[in-house]
């Protein structure tokens, strides 16, 4: 099941996705697409990186974080109800069938008549790089698999700091991180 994120009409939506490059500059191509991750590539690509740069993008989509250090989280500007749906973040690790695929469900809510900051919005602003594994337990490290010359690990960061936070109760699965190298 995909991880769910929420935003209001007119806000920017934030869909987290991270990996850790093995060494400075050893980047892995990433694609973001609208729709669940297919077997290969991304369907309906909205943004793509190569081994150096963002080399394809569409107008309202960008990577606001430090993507050359592995923060490939997607920002969608000024969302509308039509932006609801599943988005695919695909870390295109070299080798056959080595890609890591993350499906993230974006739910767009109508804008409130009286604008008031929501807890979710406060959280995103306060912890833009927040990652946890599934559930809200202590930080854990789970081996996803081994590949030739590549260790692939799903890691959880900030979980300890947030475990006792009132915000933690409001969070569902908050992103995915893999380590390469």
């Amino acid at each position: 099941s995909e991880v769910e994120y929420r935003a209001e009409v007119g806000q920017n939506a934030y869909l987290p996705c991270f990996y850790t490059p093995a060494a400075p500059g050893n980047l892995v191509p990433v694609c973001w697409g609208k729709g669940a991750c297919p077997v290969f590539e991304c369907g309906n690509v909205v943004l793509r990186t190569d081994e150096r740069d963002v080399n394809y993008w569409t107008s309202r989509y960008w990577l606001n974080g430090d993507f050359r250090k592995g923060d490939v989280s997607l920002t969608i500007e000024n969302v509308t109800l039509a932006d609801s749906g599943i988005y695919c973040c695909r870390i295109q690790i070299p080798g056959i069938m080595n890609d890591e695929k993350f499906n993230l469900k974006l739910v767009i809510k109508p804008a409130k008549v009286t604008p008031a900051p929501t807890r979710q919005r406060d959280f995103t602003a306060a912890f833009p790089r927040m990652l946890t594994t599934r559930g809200h337990g202590p930080a854990e490290t789970q081996t996803l698999g081994s590949l030739p010359d590549i260790n692939l690990t799903q890691i959880s960061t900030l979980a300890n700091e947030l475990r006792d936070s009132r915000l933690a109760n409001d969070l569902r699965d908050s992103g995915a991180t893999i380590r390469i190298g």
């Epitope: 060494a23 400075p24 500059g25 050893n26 190569d50 081994e51 150096r52 740069d53 963002v54 080399n55 993008w57 107008s59 309202r60 989509y61 960008w62 990577l63 606001n64 974080g65 430090d66 993507f67 050359r68 250090k69 920002t75 500007e77």
Partner: antibody, heavy 120, light 108 residues
Framework: QVTLKESGPGILQPSQTLSLTCSFS??????????VGWIRQPSGKGLEWLAH???????RYNPALKSRLTISKDTSSSQVFLKIASVDTADTATYYC????????????WGQGTSVTVSS | QIVLTQSPTIMSASPGEKVTLTCSAS???????LYWYQQKPGSSPKLWIY???NLASGVPARFSGSGSGTSYSLTISSLEAEDAASYFC?????????FGGGTKLEIK
């Protein structure tokens, strides 16, 4: 101490090939993440990015000029080269080489620039 | 490609004034890779601000940078005579890398 120094022909004629050399010290292009790029600036105007070459020989070119540009490196002699084919008067500018690093500050060191005039 | 539009093109201000230069991107870019350079006549550009808000070595604390997405700015809290120069924004988030047209800052 990081230094970069550009050298070029100074003056050349339209349709010729411009060859520029960037000689640098204080860093190595064999270091993972390191790169060297070329920027130009016509007199009194803005900056235009031309090309980059990285430690692993990945190359990037300005698409508007890509068909005329060739960037290369000689890591052992700490030099980067840029060739611009079929020059015309619009290529008259000061050419700078710059050091970059992929995950920190880019273009943190610039050469003094070399002036190139294309004239018949 | 990402077009960076700087405004104003030329501005004149008095010592002690607060000055803000803006850089607008045609599409959103990573704030980690939005840079500002200062250039004085006859000299090479100098890295001034990197990653939107980080001051390069030796840059006075009266300078600051901010922004995200498509809108970025460089602010001088109290202008000094030595700040007279041209300022260029630059992005190397998206290929091809691009520069803004520059803002020439003059002192009254």
């Amino acid at each position: 101490q990081v230094t970069l120094k550009e050298s070029g022909p100074g003056i050349l004629q339209p349709s010729q090939t411009l060859s520029l050399t960037c000689s640098f010290s204080g860093f190595s292009l064999s270091t993972s993440g390191m790169g060297v790029g070329w920027i130009r600036q016509p007199s009194g105007k803005g900056l235009e990015w031309l090309a980059h070459i990285w430690w692993d020989d990945v190359k990037r070119y300005n698409p508007a000029l890509k068909s005329r540009l060739t960037i290369s490196k000689d890591t052992s002699s700490s030099q980067v080269f840029l060739k611009i084919a079929s020059v015309d008067t619009a290529d008259t500018a000061t050419y700078y080489c710059v050091r970059t690093f992929i995950t920190t500050t880019t273009m943190d060191y610039w050469g003094q620039g070399t002036s190139v005039t294309v004239s018949s | 490609q990402i077009v960076l539009t700087q405004s104003p093109t030329i501005m004149s201000a008095s010592p002690g004034e607060k000055v803000t230069l803006t850089c607008s991107a045609s599409s959103g870019i990573s704030s980690s890779y939005l840079y500002w350079y200062q250039q004085k006549p006859g000299s090479s550009p100098k890295l001034w601000i990197y990653g939107t808000s980080n001051l390069a070595s030796g840059v006075p604390a009266r300078f600051s940078g901010s922004g995200s997405g498509t809108s970025y700015s460089l602010t001088i809290s109290s202008l000094e005579a030595e700040d007279a120069a041209s300022y260029f924004c630059h992005q190397w988030s998206n290929y091809p890398y691009t520069f803004g047209g520059g803002t020439k800052l003059e002192i009254k």
